[in-house]
């Protein structure tokens, strides 16, 4: 650690005195201190001498000696008071700039330590400090305003009591800057704009920040627009607004508009697209297939996307049949706006009943005309099966009718014993009917098929079962011949709760 001669923490001299401060270290040493004039600095081997032969109040301050080559960065310091009866203060700065909530040191150094008891801090022209100003004083460093606030940005003077009267320092301007968290906040409205040629349009670009030092501009396809700026201050934020008003838009006004704001922390930008069209438009589309198949009892949401300008004048969902003249309940229709020109309309169909299959149409209208989008809803049903014994062309035949959607496949099983359902161990024979006869196949209805199994002789200790299945489920009917005739066993009743 360097050593300073004289080896005292502080030195008090009179104006005009010669002051010599010597610093000695192991290696080269250097002096540093307030940038006060009239010092001469010279080196002498491993020592550095700071001297003046005419000390003034401006030389009051703390002088520090460091050894640049010392890895531990040791230093020594001495504080010099130049005790001028006419000048109680040496002010080291015209202005002090800090960020909010930092301590602000106002560097009025007392030139005479004896005066410490009578010091105070005031605002210029003798005005008292603002309420809640918390400050402390050090004769070596000056007044510290603790946790400075933006509102404390004022001009201050240091006051000392000399011979019963207050002597003021020159003023120090305190600038407390807001802490800027990042680039200015931006809004660009609207987020998207569509106009018909000849209509009026407005685009507003606004930026705000806690600090007034920021720039904002609006550009169209990379060309900066010259727009008058409106400035405002509210909610403790500075706001700058650029408003582009277009009385009659044309195709050259279309394109990308960017709102750009920047400050010392960086740049923010946001963009929007302006479309200019020749006439009104209305487009309907769906991400869903327009042909829908749903299992009976389940629910379905039909969704239509609408792109339109100008806005819709009317819209509704309509059931076009074929089962009844009921119309969808309005409470099941829902509209959500994705953005200004795109909307999604949803029709919720919960727990679908057989009578609700059919065509659903969404109709919408704007000045561009009417448009419709129609969905076809077919319900899926598990097969229902029945078997009867009959004679066809003199031959004994088992006739199986299966009804469901999609069209059921039919399989016949013959098994030993009397049973409601053949299991694998009992099966004697299996016949698949690849082409059952289609009895009915109307849109939105079940498909009914019929399969015939010609049986020359019914075996009385056996069961004949007709099984039908489709993608929804399966159904079966067991036929048990008995001596007195035939006996049929339908499966457990098919429970249906719509």
């Amino acid at each position: 650690i360097p050593v300073i001669e004289p080896s005292v923490p502080e030195l008090v001299v009179k104006p005009g005195a010669t002051v010599t401060l010597r610093c000695v270290g192991n290696g080269s040493v250097e002096w540093d201190g307030p940038p006060s004039p009239h010092w001469t600095l010279y080196s002498d081997g491993s020592s550095s001498i700071l001297s003046t032969n005419n000390a003034t109040f401006q030389n009051t301050g703390t002088y520090r000696c460091t050894e640049p080559g010392d890895p531990l960065g040791g230093s020594a310091a001495i504080h010099l008071y130049v005790k001028d009866p006419a000048r109680p203060w040496n002010v080291l700065a015209q202005e002090v700039v800090v960020f909010e909530d930092q301590d602000a040191l106002l560097p009025c150094l007392l030139t005479d330590p004896v005066l410490e008891a009578g010091v105070s801090l005031v605002r210029v022209r003798g005005r008292p400090l603002m309420r809640h100003t918390n400050y402390s004083f050090s004769p070596w460093h000056g007044f510290t305003i603790h946790r400075a606030k933006f509102i404390q940005s004022q001009d201050y003077q240091c006051s000392a009591l000399m011979g019963g009267r207050k002597v003021m320092s020159i003023s120090i301007r305190l600038k407390v800057q807001k802490v800027i968290p990042g680039p200015p906040a931006l809004t660009l409205v609207p987020a998207e704009l569509v106009r018909i040629r000849g209509e009026a349009a407005q685009i507003v670009c606004s930026a705000s920040s806690v600090d007034v030092n920021f720039d904002v501009f609006l550009q169209h396809n990379n060309t900066k627009l010259a727009i008058p700026q409106q400035s405002d201050f509210h909610n403790n934020r500075y706001q700058k607004v650029l408003t582009l008003n277009l009385d009659q838009v044309d195709f050259q006004h279309a394109g990308n508009y960017s709102c750009v704001a920047s400050n010392v922390q960086g740049k923010h930008s946001t963009s929007m697209f302006f479309r200019v069209v020749e006439s009104a438009y209305l487009n309907l589309s769906s991400e869903q297939n327009l042909i829908q198949e749903v299992t009976v009892g389940e629910g379905l949401n039909l969704k239509v996307m609408v792109e339109a300008y100008p806005g819709l004048q009317g819209f509704n969902w309509t059931y076009l049949g074929p089962f009844s003249d009921h119309q969808p309940e309005p409470k099941l229709a829902n509209a959500t706006t994705k953005d200004t020109y795109r909307h999604t309309f949803t029709l919720s169909l919960p727990r679908l009943k057989p009578s609700e299959a059919g065509r659903y149409s969404f109709l919408a209208r704007n000045p561009g005309g009417w448009r419709a989008l129609t969905f076809e809803l077919t319900l899926r049903y598990p097969p229902e099966v029945s078997v009867i014994w009959t004679f066809i062309n003199g031959s004994g035949t088992l006739l199986c009718a299966a009804s469901g959607y999609p069209q059921p496949n039919v399989t016949w099983l013959q098994c030993s014993g009397h049973t409601d359902r053949c299991d694998e161990a009992q099966v004697l024979q299996v016949w698949d009917d690849p082409y059952p006869e289609v009895l009915s196949q109307e849109p939105f209805h079940k498909v009914t098929v019929q399969s015939l199994l010609t049986v020359e002789t019914l075996e009385h200790n056996q069961t004949y079962e007709c099984r039908a299945h489709n993608s929804v489920g399966s159904g079966s009917w067991a036929f048990i011949p008995i001596s007195a005739g035939a006996h049929t066993h339908p499966p457990d009743e098919f429970l249906f709760t719509p």
Partner: antibody, heavy 117, light 110 residues
Framework: QVQPQESGPGLVKPSETLSLTCTVS????????WSWIRQPAGTGLEWIGR???????NYNSSLKSRVTMSVDTSKNQFSLKLSSVTAADTAVYYC???????????WGQGTLVTVSS | QSVLTQPPSASGTPGQRVTISCSGS????????VNWYQQLPGTAPKLLIY???QRPSGVPDRFSGSKSGTSGSLAISGLKSEDEADYYC???????????FGGGTKLTVL
């Protein structure tokens, strides 16, 4: 070795604010005075002002109304703002450490700022 | 117009001694010390002489400074081609309460 480094936009429009930052590597900025000095092309040096790490500033009287300096010790950097710039503010701007008044012992390499529309 | 006055140019041949003057007033050089800076082409200025006549470590002893009244001077002996640069003087000015520079002297080594 202490090494100051200036950064900021190279082009500023007339009437706007010039903002530069000086980041110091190789040593702490604390406890020292730091100055901004500029040099218009082909001419001499002009002292703009200085800032101490506590935020105390002294400015060249001819520029005082347009200059603000601030310091951020946590980032080991200080900054210069010069408002209402004109073409006459076009120059290479240097930041430097200042000792004992006018002894500028460490300089940045300088950054050219052009004021033009 | 600089507060401190320097000749715009100076020249010398290798090995020669050249002197650059810096003239001020009582409010600057008359009451404060003079510092000198060397600026090689395309680079930042570098401290050459401080406190009238002190050389920072690394500066050759061919460079020396002096002050008399309200003027300062920089002498370069044994001139070398690498000394070709701009040289600036600087001092504190009590009236302006700030640092003032000379206009600079362009030294050419012939």
């Amino acid at each position: 070795q202490v090494q100051p480094q200036e950064s900021g936009p190279g082009l500023v429009k007339p009437s706007e604010t010039l903002s530069l930052t000086c980041t110091v590597s190789g040593g702490s900025i604390s406890g020292y005075y730091w100055s901004w000095i500029r040099q218009p092309a082909g001419t001499g040096l002009e002292w703009i002002g200085r800032i101490y790490t506590s935020g105390s500033t002294n400015y060249n009287s001819s520029l005082k109304s347009r200059v603000t300096m601030s310091v951020d010790t946590s980032k080991n950097q200080f900054s210069l703002k010069l408002s209402s710039v004109t073409a006459a503010d076009t120059a290479v701007y240097y930041c430097a450490r200042e000792r004992m008044a006018t002894i500028f012992d460490y300089w940045g390499q300088g950054t050219l700022v052009t004021v033009s529309s | 117009q600089s507060v401190l006055t320097q000749p715009p140019s100076a020249s010398g041949t290798p090995g020669q001694r050249v002197t650059i003057s810096c003239s001020g007033s009582s409010s600057n050089i008359g009451s404060n010390t003079v510092n000198w800076y060397q600026q090689l082409p395309g680079t930042a200025p570098k401290l050459l002489i401080y406190s009238n006549n002190q050389r920072p470590s690394g500066v050759p002893d061919r460079f020396s400074g002096s002050k008399s009244g309200t003027s300062g001077s920089l002498a370069i002996s044994g001139l070398k081609s690498e000394d070709e640069a701009d040289y600036y003087c600087a001092a504190w000015d009590d009236s302006l309460n700030g640092v003032v520079f000379g206009g600079g002297t362009k030294l050419t080594v012939l």
